[in-house]
């Protein structure tokens, strides 16, 4: 009776369990009753990092110097190239697909520590009583305006992204 499931590192095809290709190799032809799975090593600048039945290897990532990238770790037939940024620059994501001089803090966050050559900008959420309505790499959270000191009253409450809105006090007639 033909199998309905296969062991680990095998795949089911034509009612038959075939061996997967090992990392660093791609599938050329499926196994048959009489022959083993045929696999071929990935070419230069290609890789496959899992046991697979892929007919094409993946291209190594290109670390584009025009984006400030350089090779941190050269790819092999089983691993992708790892990129990093030029000294003094910082990756925009875990995958490091582009570089920034330093990141900025979004509205609602202030700069706790300005970037240096070795560390990126450190942001902190604006606490109650403070706000930031801009993206910035140097501005701290600003305190809400004190309406009382201007002999005014709060007409609209502040948030972490907006200042309070002050207005005249209602005079009793």
């Amino acid at each position: 009776e033909p199998p309905t499931a296969c062991r680990e590192k095998q795949y089911l095809i034509n009612s038959q369990c075939c061996s997967l290709c090992q990392p660093g190799q791609k599938l050329v032809s499926d196994c048959t009753e009489f022959t083993e799975t045929e696999c071929l090593p990935c070419g230069e600048s290609e890789f496959l990092d899992t046991w697979n039945r892929e007919t094409h290897c993946h291209q190594h990532k290109y670390c584009d110097p025009n984006l400030g990238l350089r090779v941190q770790q050269k790819g092999t037939s089983e691993t992708d190239t790892i990129c990093t940024c030029e000294e003094g620059w910082h990756c925009t994501s875990e995958a490091c697909e582009s570089c920034v001089l330093h990141r900025s803090c979004s509205p609602g966050f202030g700069v706790k520590q300005i970037a240096t050559g070795v560390s990126d900008t450190i942001c902190e959420p604006c606490p109650v009583g403070f706000f930031s309505n801009v993206s910035s790499a140097f501005e701290k959270c600003h305190p809400w305006t004190s309406c009382e000191t201007k002999d005014l009253v709060v007409q609209q409450a502040g948030t972490n992204k907006t200042d309070v809105v002050c207005g005249p006090q209602d005079r009793l007639r």
Epitope: N66, L67, E86, V100, H102, S104, V134, S135, A137
Partner: nanobody, 116 residues
Framework: EVQLLESGGGLVQPGGSLRLSCAAS???????EMWWVRQAPGKGLERVS?????????YYADSVKGRFTISRDNSKNTLYLQMNSLRAEDTAVYHC?????????WGQGTLVTVSS
């Protein structure tokens, strides 16, 4: 295409002054926080000064506080750095940069050499 073109560098004696300019194009200059960043020979990048889009708030590194002044003219799409009381340690290539500070937006810079 974003372009940042720095100018005004040159050779100056210790104690002298220079005014750097950065002509911006390809984006709405008045909407962006701008920075001056320098790189001394064989050294890392140092963030020198920054200014908010309206020109009302500024930042200075401790090493230049009281000597350098950053300003901007949004009508001319130009950023400035007035450098006074220059020292040998101010020798560097000075770049202007715009938020979000991507590598592609990085200008070539202008060289400032402070030497007697």
């Amino acid at each position: 295409e974003v372009q940042l073109l720095e100018s005004g560098g040159g050779l100056v004696q210790p104690g002298g002054s220079l005014r750097l300019s950065c002509a911006a194009s390809g984006f709405t200059f008045r909407d962006y926080e701008m920075w001056w960043v320098r790189q001394a020979p064989g050294k890392g990048l140092e963030r020198v000064s920054a200014i908010n889009p309206q020109g009302t708030r500024t930042y200075y590194a401790d090493s230049v506080k009281g000597r350098f002044t950053i300003s901007r003219d949004n009508s001319k799409n130009t950023l400035y750095l007035q450098m006074n009381s220059l020292r040998a340690e101010d020798t560097a290539v000075y770049h202007c940069a715009k938020l979000p500070f991507t590598f592609e937006d990085w200008g070539q810079g202008t060289l400032v050499t402070v030497s007697s």
